[in-house]
């Protein structure tokens, strides 16, 4: 699949089952470092999400016998968040002292911000199709966590690619194709 996006691209295959995506994912070569932020025009209280990048990802979905004919497109949130108070006479050293002194108690992470549900259709070897619903990431954000929060729960917000979950529809159809909803 050819994609000339200006952001980093990932391409891999995901099986639409409740388990985590396949670990033998292949990583495309990075083409660019993602989004860039400028301090120009920001007021002194603006926080810049330095390093929180929205990386474009493409992945084919397969459930064994059936595969999507086009890859699913979503964002992967990556990078480390270093929120900066932007001051008129900002000096890096001063920022470093403040940031690192607080680091033991709170931490910023680049996490999923917006998602949307998307329908995908897999083409099967016997000519039939299967339909799934998948949640894809469409925006990222920096989010602050306290150290205590981090230690008590490692499920900040899923940073892995979309994990489709399959369950049966309540109404049945007299059709050789099958449809699955995913949450």
């Amino acid at each position: 699949f050819k994609n000339d996006a200006t952001e980093i691209l990932y391409s891999h295959v995901v099986k639409p089952v409740p388990a985590h995506p396949s670990s033998n994912s292949t990583l495309n070569q990075a083409r660019n470092g993602g989004r860039h932020f400028s301090n120009t025009g920001l007021d002194r209280n603006t926080r810049v999400q330095v390093g929180c990048r929205e990386l474009r990802s493409t992945k084919y979905i397969s459930d064994g016998q059936c595969t999507s004919i086009s890859p699913l497109k979503e964002l992967v949130c990556a990078g480390e968040c270093l929120p900066l108070p932007v001051l008129p006479n900002w000096i890096g050293g001063g920022y470093g002292t403040k940031y690192w002194s607080r680091r033991s108690s709170q931490e910023w992470r680049c996490v999923n911000d917006k998602t949307r549900t998307q329908r995908i259709q897999l083409q099967c070897q016997d000519g039939s199709t299967r339909t799934y619903k998948i949640t894809v990431v469409t925006a990222c954000k920096c989010k602050r966590y306290t150290r205590q929060h981090n230690e008590s729960s490692h499920n900040f917000e899923s940073m892995s690619p979309a994990k489709p979950v399959q369950h049966h529809r309540e109404r049945k159809r007299a059709s050789k194709s099958s449809k699955h909803s995913m949450s």
Epitope: S70, Q118, R119, T129, R130, T131, V136, T138, A139
Partner: antibody, heavy 119, light 110 residues
Framework: QVQLQESGPGLVKPSETLSLTCTVS????????VHWVRQPPGKGLEWIGV???????DYNSALKSRVTISRDTSKNQFSLKLSSVTAADTAVYYC?????????????WGQGTMVTVSS | QVMLTQPHSVSESPGKTVTISCKLN????????IHWYQQREGRSPTTVIY?????PDGVPDRFSGSIDSSSNSASLTISGLKTEDEADYFC?????????FGGGTKLTVL
């Protein structure tokens, strides 16, 4: 060779039901999605509804209460019924083949049939 | 509600290059597939670009498609304009699984 051909009356009276049939060849209705799209004179394209490859349907929310799309796979046909029509439903109606999602562009269009709603 | 917005009309001289934009009002356009259709007067639409930047067989390489994340828009570029390119152009995508169209752009070749 993929083909889609619309058929049905070109004139429908207000408050009646518009009925169109699309006969397809060169592909199976169980392997592709098929849509109805209309275009009022001098205006843009308006999606009416879809018959998914698995037999499920979805409709434009603005038309949902008046639209029914169904298929007869043995005849390679699918149909559109639009009830309680008004002059605003006057348009060229196209049946269209759509690829599978994600992506799913409309790769083949019928030639279109003009339907006028008038008494 | 997800919407695709196109300029109502554009015009350019033969041999020149013209670009038609299609702006998405929400989300990140990089997570959508954008398709482009050409509709000549009195004819059915035909695909000129699908999947953001791919050309169907038979469509000349004068037609190209691209996505610009910074403006959250897609573009159809036609180079070496010919009089036969005069037509309406529509962009198309899906909101979840519901098809959405741009309002269309009338291209006039002067």
């Amino acid at each position: 060779q993929v083909q889609l051909q619309e058929s049905g009356p070109g004139l429908v009276k207000p408050s009646e039901t518009l009925s169109l049939t699309c006969t397809v060849s060169g592909f199976s209705l169980t392997s592709y999605n098929v849509h109805w799209v209309r275009q009022p004179p001098g205006k843009g394209l308006e999606w009416i509804g879809v018959l998914w490859s698995d037999g499920d349907t979805d409709y434009n929310s603005a038309l949902k209460s008046r639209v029914t799309i169904s298929r007869d796979t043995s005849k390679n046909q699918f149909s559109l019924k639009l009830s309680s029509v008004t002059a605003a439903d006057t348009a060229v109606y196209y049946c269209v083949r759509g690829g599978l999602l994600p992506g799913g562009y409309f790769d083949y269009w019928g030639q279109g049939t003009m339907v006028t709603v008038s008494s | 509600q997800v919407m695709l917005t196109q300029p109502h009309s554009v015009s350019e001289s033969p041999g020149k290059t013209v670009t038609i934009s299609c702006k998405l009002n929400s989300d990140n356009i990089g997570t959508y597939y954008i398709h482009w259709y050409q509709q000549r007067e009195g004819r059915s639409p035909t695909t000129v670009i699908y999947g953001d930047d791919k050309r169907p067989d038979g469509v000349p390489d004068r037609f190209s498609g691209s996505i610009d994340s910074s403006s959250n828009s897609a573009s159809l570029t036609i180079s070496g304009l010919k009089t036969e390119d005069e037509a309406d152009y529509f962009c198309h995508s899906y909101d979840d699984h519901i098809p959405i169209f741009g309002g269309g752009t009338k291209l006039t070749v002067l």
